[in-house]
């Protein structure tokens, strides 16, 4: 697995440099997330063809992924900064649930989806600093999720396939929506 | 385990009209989305149509408002209704169901866990 932000070599090399503000960490924990998921999506693509046909082979999707709309503030039309920081802090704490799905599912990226896992979970503790109104954030109920979790495993080898297809592709998206959203924070 | 038997295959004139049935054994149908498959001779199983467990109709386009699939759970049966029939429909039609409560509704064979035997359609012109 890649070393964490805050751990590579260059940080020892250079031990003078100024420390990361605030903001500076969380985008780069954010960018490091993006590239376990670039390296798990990389295994499943190969693993089957889901990522080129799973457009039109789904009719219904239940999963219920957390997704940016207009009405969370995080675009630039309607931009919210509190509205917008509730709502990616939300969503990720619904992503944890999807995220400890995943675990299972990498045969040659099993370190990598462990990362992702514990580095969104560091992310998240970033993000509750950063928010003025934690009041404001629902966390899931862990009884549903434990129940989701059953249901996402029940399915059939092919479904699961195409659930960790799914769940990839919308943390991606979910997670650069946040990052341009925090670039203007 | 799940059983799924198709009734109401047979031969038709162009323009004319079948009804498929279903019958699935089993108490949990309810939960299951169930779907139609068909397979004309040295072709792939293609596709028909599927109804979810929520109760959302989907087609494939060749068959939009000719085909409709209904699902009566009181009686562990799905339906499927085929007006306007072409000679391109002609086939073995099957039944399909998913294990219980599945989050992704798919029309790839892959997504379905239990078969029946299938039933054939004939349209002659």
């Known amino acids: 697995a890649p070393v964490p932000p805050g751990e590579d070599s260059k940080d020892v090399a250079a031990p003078h440099r100024q420390p990361l503000t605030s903001s500076e960490r969380i985008d780069k924990q954010i960018r490091y997330i993006l590239d376990g998921i670039s390296a798990l999506r990389k295994e499943t693509c190969n693993k089957s063809n889901m990522c080129e046909s799973s457009k039109e082979a789904l009719a219904e999707n239940n999963l219920n992924l957390p997704k940016m709309a207009e009405k969370d503030g995080c675009f630039q039309s309607g931009f919210n900064e509190e509205t917008c920081l509730v709502k990616i802090i939300t969503g990720l704490l619904e992503f944890e649930v999807y995220l400890e799905y995943l675990q299972n599912r990498f045969e040659s990226s099993e370190e990598q989806a462990r990362a992702v896992q514990m580095s969104t979970k560091v992310l998240i503790q970033f993000l509750q600093k950063k928010a003025k109104n934690l009041d404001a954030i629902t966390t899931p109920d862990p009884t549903t999720n434990a129940s989701l979790l059953t249901k996402l495993q029940a399915q059939n080898q092919w479904l699961q396939d195409m659930t960790t297809h799914l769940i990839l592709r919308s943390f991606k998206e979910f997670l650069q929506s946040s990052l341009r959203a925090l670039r203007q924070m | 385990q799940v059983q799924l038997a198709e009734t109401g295959g047979g031969s038709v004139q162009a323009g004319g009209s079948l009804t498929l049935s279903c019958a699935a054994s089993?108490?949990?149908?309810?939960?299951?989305?169930m779907g139609w498959f068909r397979q004309a001779p040295g072709k792939e199983r293609e596709f028909v149509a599927v109804?979810?467990?929520?109760?959302?109709?989907y087609y494939t386009d060749s068959v939009k408002g000719r085909f409709t699939i209904s699902r009566d759970d009181a009686k562990n049966t799905v339906y499927l209704q085929m007006n306007s029939l072409k000679p391109e429909d002609t086939a073995v039609y099957y039944c399909?169901?998913?294990?219980?409560?599945?989050?992704?509704?798919?029309?790839?064979?892959?997504?379905?866990?239990?078969w029946g035997q299938g039933t054939q359609v004939t349209v002659s012109s």
């Open positions: 109804i979810s467990w929520t109760g959302s109709p």
């Open positions: 399909a169901a998913t294990s219980e409560h599945v989050m992704l509704v798919v029309t790839t064979r892959g997504g379905y866990d239990y």
């Open positions: 089993g108490r949990t149908f309810s939960s299951r989305a």
